[in-house]
């Protein structure tokens, strides 16, 4: 759920690290409502999701391993 | 070593709810979602949810949206499923079912499983 | 949601030979497919992750290979604790929906 490239809300879904290519972080104190991780899929779709979320800390975690790793 | 017990076997009328205890033993039990998947009389398995034990974050199929619902004991390490307003279809063996992350995301230890049957 | 379609439904097979099961998705997963072996009267039992990765304990005679919609599990010379029913199962994305499954019987 996003508006204007804000997330509104989150998804009720899981996601696995495999279909996911990189994130975005949404920050409440730059000019949008809520705090959220934007996933970017291999399907080219933007899903919102909750920081808080251990599956989502998770693939965040994953990526961001790789990214170092480079 | 990893132990996932289950609740024993129920009989239940047409609309009534039972709810399925799992009892996990052996690993650090935050560390891990629990699933649960039904498997009716002579049909395949069916994936009803997960439950993440850290914060009781749970997702379901929509098949079982407002008639199911998980919730987490971590001072006793048990997961509940409840399912109401049962009908004769509901009758299965319910199945836990640790989910792990580090193994692309398998369920790579089950519980037992409770039979639950529903009749009038 | 996706769909997972498994062939065959039921397979005769003897001791000693080489069968495969077939799993497709109704769409890309990726990768994300996990395989389990079920025997009458008991719990599912991980065999595959990932596709193509062992679980822990699964004699090497069981292997998983694929990609896309298309997977499939092989087993390179049956025994007789093999017969019993495979699903496969799609993780990629909840709900995590399984195959309707394959009962490998004795011929």
């Known amino acids: 759920a996003s508006n204007f490239d804000c997330c509104l809300g989150y998804t009720d879904r899981i996601l696995h690290p495999k279909f996911i290519v990189g994130f975005t972080r949404q920050l409440a104190n730059e000019g949008c409502d809520i705090n959220a991780i934007i996933f970017h899929t291999k399907k080219k779709l933007s899903v919102c999701a909750n920081p808080k979320q251990t599956w989502v800390k998770y693939i965040v975690r994953l990526l961001s391993k790789k990214v170092k790793n480079m | 070593q990893v132990q996932l017990v289950q609740s024993g076997a129920e009989v239940k009328k047409p609309g009534a709810s039972v709810k399925v205890s799992c009892k996990a033993s052996?690993?650090?039990?935050?560390?891990?979602?629990m699933h649960w998947v039904r498997q009716a009389p002579g049909q395949g398995l069916e994936w009803m949810g997960v439950?993440?034990?850290?914060?009781?974050?749970?997702t379901y199929a929509q098949k079982f949206q407002g008639r199911v619902t998980m919730t987490v004991d971590t001072s006793t390490s048990t997961v509940y499923m409840e399912l109401s307003s049962l009908r004769s279809e509901d009758t299965a063996v319910y199945y836990c079912?640790?989910?792990?992350?580090?193994?692309?995301?398998?369920?790579?230890?089950w519980g037992q499983g409770t039979l639950v049957t529903v009749s009038s | 949601d996706i769909q997972m379609t498994q062939s065959p439904s039921s397979l005769s097979a003897s001791v000693g030979d080489r069968v495969t099961i077939t799993c497709r998705a109704s769409?890309?997963?990726?990768?994300?497919l996990n395989w389990y072996q079920q025997k009458p009267g008991k719990a599912p039992k991980l065999l595959i992750y990932?596709?193509?990765n062992l679980a822990d304990g699964v004699p090497s005679r069981f292997s998983g290979s694929g990609s896309g919609r298309q997977y499939s599990l092989t087993i390179s010379s049956l025994q007789p604790e093999d017969f019993a029913t495979y699903y496969c199962?799609?993780?990629?994305?909840?709900?995590?929906?399984f195959g309707g499954g394959t009962k490998l019987e004795i011929k």
């Open positions: 990932g596709a193509t």
């Open positions: 439950i993440d034990p850290s914060d009781s974050y749970t």
């Open positions: 079912a640790r989910g792990n992350y580090g193994v692309d995301y398998a369920m790579d230890y």
């Open positions: 199962q799609n993780v990629l994305i909840t709900p995590y929906t």
């Open positions: 769409e890309n997963i990726y990768g994300a």
């Open positions: 052996g690993y650090t039990f935050t560390n891990y979602w």
